[in-house]
Structures are given as structure tokens and as C-alpha cells.
């Protein structure tokens, strides 16, 4: 029940982070005009990853697209990049975690498979996470670095009278909606993981062997399985392999150590 | 086509407040600002302040003190409201159309006398 | 607040000649963002309000004739009359509208001989 949930709970905490990270990327807001020099501007522009907009105090906004590919920063085609790259991971792991849900019952698939796939959409999702946590961050630090360099200029070559201000970006909406997102689709991801532990608890596998007690004989079987009374007296036909004990009539097979590899 | 007509009391006693109405037709306020601007006589132009057309304003910050203007959507008015005037607020007042920035339409004007 | 500069202050010139006025502003009135200039130009004829010419610093205005020309870009502006009028007798203001409050600069009287 707790595996179930906690596989649940991390299949929709990645959806709403892969949603934000989609979010993010579609958003102009990326770099807002800094107001702190010239707070009463009639004019107010922002950025995104795809165009940069201008908005006028009178409601009318005006957006122009990067309609270049050669000519933009070689910073900002990396951050699409990651963010691209993070949707993509995001929305395939998604896609494989919807088969891989425990209450979601797909033909005569087994838990082991399952497991696999609940693994492989964690190991997406925290992939994708890390994407878009490292494309905002680039971003940001490029803005920072963009920032003081336009407050450097703004305070020289101010000999005349005349005052040219410059400029200045700050931290958009979307970088912080990119973050939380990012942040959100890597603790799904996580959590995906952890259910997939649940899904397959980790089994020491050792041939049987069998301890010869004077008097009352046991048979002992290491790795969880029943240990049966009396030499030789096994009802059920136990076949032991290399790798992995496994009864012929058990219900649930548990993939072994050796299918994660 | 785009009207507006100024609407004012003519003749104010000074330390008095001056109200004026422009009245727009041939176009909505919930979807234009709406300027006001002062010309005293034989001087240049003075900006006033605008409404826009969700409600926000912005002022001339030497008159933001004693100024207000507001609007009435349904009515299709627009109110200047300036406290505390003094002859040197005797002026032709104009309310004119915001259009991307710029005043495209504007009202023929109300003058505006301060004497006692 | 912008303070707008406009020279010369008044101009008696010959129906028919070319006119060039000038405007300067305290702060650039280029916004990067879109790369227009939001300076406005005005004509105020006797007795009537003002009448837009020409926004964003080049663009005329609809129903404007083409005889009027605004140029200029960051902090300098001009405007142009090609070949001057009778009827274009009257003062033009030129208009920040950047940065509030709007500032108008005091005007170019033109006079015909």
C-alpha cells in the first residue's frame, strides 16, 4: 500500500513539475526590465527563451520572436537546450510511468517489469529535473553577470549632461517557476526510485543449502523462503538456479539483484 | 467617430477645487487612456496625468498632491479633479485619447479662470 | 523628470522653403526592448488643441501630409517640413512619452513671411 502510494504520490509530483518545466519554457518572463533606475517608465520590456516582448503602460503589448538561430547567444541556445531536453526526458518518463503504476493493472505484466520501468521513469524524471534546474540556473547566471556589467557601463562615460540609461535585466517569473519545477520533477523522480525498491525488495540469493542437525533435521533455506522440516520429507518439487531460488509454484516472482544492472 | 468634450465651471475662486468632465464617445475607456493636459495662456502645453484603462493612474509628480482623476466606464466619463488652485492654474484644459503613447484625439478644451 | 529642449524658439521662414526644428531630451527616449523611440511631435494651430503629427520619433501620423518628417533616435530629434506651407503656420511641441510624467518642450513658433 505505502509502495502504491508513494509510486502515486511521485507520478503526480513529477506531472505537475514536468508541466512547469513546459511552463517555464513557454514563458516571455524570463528577464524583466530592472525598474530600480527608472521606476516611472511608460514602457516595460521582458524576455523569454523564444521572443522578447514590450509592454505599454496604455495595456498594449508588442513581442518579437528570435527569428536567428546563428545570431543568438551561444548561453541562450544552451538553455534551450536543457530546458527542450528536460521536457523531452520528462515527458517519456512519464509515459513509461503510466504503465509502470501499481493500480494500473496492463495485461499480464509482471512486477518485476514494473519495478523496472517504475526505476527507469524515476531515473528520467530526476535526469529532466536536473535539466531545467541547470537551464534556469545558466540563465540566471548570465543575467547576474549581464546585470553588473550594464551597472558598470551605466556609471561611466557620463561626462555631458545628457544621461543614455541602459538597460538593466532581472530574475523573470519564469526562472523561479523553472526552479520549483525543476525541483518538484527530481523529488518525483526520487520518490519514483524509492517505490521501485518497494516494488522489488533486494533478495540475497544463495544456492540452498542444507544444515544437518543431530536428531530433529532442518532444511534451511537462506533469502526469505520457508525452511522445511525433516530430511527429504518436501512435498513440493523445489527447483534451485544458478542466481536466483525460485519455486515453481510461487505466485509473485521478484526480479533479482542482477536485473537492475 | 472619436469625440471628447471638456466640461468645466469656468470660473473658480483661488484655495477652491476645480472639477472638469470630459465626456468620449466613439470609443471605450476600458479600452483607452485617457490624458489631461493644461495650457496656460499664451505658454506651452503641460501634462497632467492620464487615467488608464484599467483604472491605474500616473501624475505629474510637481501636481500629484492636490490632483485626481478618475472615470466612470458606463457613463464614458472621465473627472479632473485639481484642490488648492491658484491664478497660476488659470489654463485652457484639454483631455485628449491615448493611442500607443501618444494623444491622437483631443477635446477643443474648457477654459479655466482663477480670480476672485 | 525628462526636461525636452526645443530650438529654435520661434522661425519666420518663406511659403515654400524647407524647415528643420530641433528637440532634445535629458534621457534617452530609445527603448531597447523594441528599438522605437517614444518621442511624439505635436501641431498646435491658433486657437485649436493640438493635433498629433508624427509618433515614435519617425512615424507620421494618418492623414499627416508627407511633407512632414520626424528623425532622429536616442537623445536628439528633428522635424522637417520639405516644403512649407501657408496652412502650416502654427507651433509644434515635441512630447516624452517614455518616461513619466510626459514632458512637453516649449515649442517652435513658425512664422510665414
Known amino acids: 500500500m505505502a509502495v502504491t502510494a508513494c509510486q502515486g504520490l511521485g507520478f503526480v509530483v513529477s506531472l505537475i513539475g514536468i508541466a512547469g518545466i513546459i511552463a517555464a519554457t513557454c514563458m516571455d518572463q524570463w528577464s524583466t526590465q530592472d525598474l530600480y533606475n527608472n521606476p516611472v517608465t511608460a514602457v516595460f520590456n521582458y524576455q523569454g527563451l523564444w521572443r522578447s516582448c514590450v509592454r505599454e503602460s496604455s495595456g498594449f503589448t508588442e513581442c518579437r520572436g528570435y527569428f536567428t538561430l546563428l545570431g543568438l547567444p551561444a548561453m541562450l541556445q544552451a538553455v534551450r537546450a536543457l530546458m527542450i531536453v528536460g521536457i523531452v526526458l520528462g515527458a517519456i518518463g512519464l509515459l513509461v510511468s503510466i504503465f509502470a503504476l501499481k493500480c494500473i493493472r496492463i495485461g499480464s505484466m509482471e512486477d518485476s517489469a514494473k519495478a523496472n520501468m517504475t526505476l527507469t521513469s524515476g531515473i528520467m524524471f530526476i535526469v529532466s529535473g536536473l535539466c531545467a534546474i541547470a537551464g534556469v540556473s545558466v540563465f540566471a547566471n548570465m543575467l547576474v553577470t549581464n546585470f553588473w556589467m550594464s551597472t558598470a557601463n551605466m556609471y561611466t562615460g557620463m561626462g555631458g549632461m545628457v544621461q543614455t540609461v541602459q538597460t538593466r535585466y532581472t530574475f523573470g517569473a519564469a526562472l523561479f517557476v523553472g526552479w520549483v519545477a525543476g525541483g518538484l520533477t527530481l523529488i518525483g523522480g526520487v520518490m519514483m526510485c524509492i517505490a521501485c525498491r518497494g516494488l522489488a525488495p533486494e533478495e540475497t540469493n544463495y544456492k540452498a543449502v542444507s544444515y544437518h542437525a543431530s536428531g530433529h533435521s532442518v532444511a534451511y533455506k537462506p533469502g526469505g523462503f520457508k525452511a522445511s522440516t525433516g530430511f527429504g520429507s518436501n512435498t513440493k518439487n523445489k527447483k534451485i538456479y544458478d542466481g536466483g531460488a525460485r519455486t515453481e509454484d510461487e505466485v509473485q516472482s521478484y526480479p533479482s539483484k542482477h536485473d537492475y544492472v | 467617430q472619436v469625440q471628447l468634450k471638456e466640461s468645466g465651471p469656468g470660473l473658480v475662486a483661488p484655495s477652491q477645487s476645480l472639477s472638469i468632465t470630459c465626456t468620449v464617445s466613439?470609443?471605450?475607456?476600458?479600452?483607452?487612456?485617457v490624458h489631461w493636459v493644461r495650457q496656460p495662456p499664451g505658454k506651452g502645453l503641460e501634462w497632467l496625468g492620464v487615467?488608464?484603462?484599467?483604472?491605474?493612474?500616473n501624475y505629474n509628480s510637481a501636481l500629484m498632491s492636490r490632483l485626481s482623476i478618475s472615470k466612470d466606464n458606463s457613463k464614458s466619463q472621465v473627472f479632473l479633479k485639481m484642490n488648492s488652485l491658484q491664478t497660476d492654474d488659470t489654463a485652457m484644459y484639454y483631455c485628449?485619447?491615448?493611442?500607443?503613447?501618444?494623444?491622437?484625439?483631443w477635446g477643443q478644451g474648457t477654459s479655466v479662470t482663477v480670480s476672485s | 523628470d525628462i526636461v525636452m529642449t526645443q530650438s529654435p524658439s520661434s522661425l519666420t521662414v518663406t511659403a515654400g522653403e524647407k524647415v528643420t526644428m530641433t528637440c532634445k531630451s535629458s534621457?534617452?527616449?530609445?527603448?531597447?526592448?523594441?528599438?522605437?523611440?517614444?518621442l511624439t511631435w505635436y501641431q498646435q494651430k491658433p486657437g485649436q488643441p493640438p493635433k498629433l503629427l508624427i509618433y515614435?520619433?519617425?512615424t507620421r501620423e494618418s492623414g499627416v501630409p508627407d511633407r512632414f518628417t520626424g528623425s532622429g533616435s536616442g537623445t536628439d530629434f528633428t522635424l522637417t517640413i520639405s516644403i512649407l506651407q501657408a496652412e502650416d503656420l502654427a507651433v509644434y511641441y515635441c512630447?516624452?512619452?517614455?518616461?513619466?510624467?510626459?514632458?512637453f518642450g516649449s515649442g517652435t513658433k513658425l512664422e510665414i513671411k
Open positions: 466613439g470609443f471605450s475607456l476600458t479600452s483607452y487612456g
Open positions: 512630447q516624452n512619452d517614455y518616461s513619466y510624467p510626459f514632458t
Open positions: 534621457q534617452s527616449l530609445l527603448n531597447s526592448g523594441n528599438q522605437k523611440n517614444y
Open positions: 485628449a485619447r491615448d493611442r500607443r503613447l501618444a494623444m491622437d484625439y
Open positions: 515614435w520619433a519617425s
Open positions: 487615467i488608464w484603462p484599467g483604472g491605474n493612474t
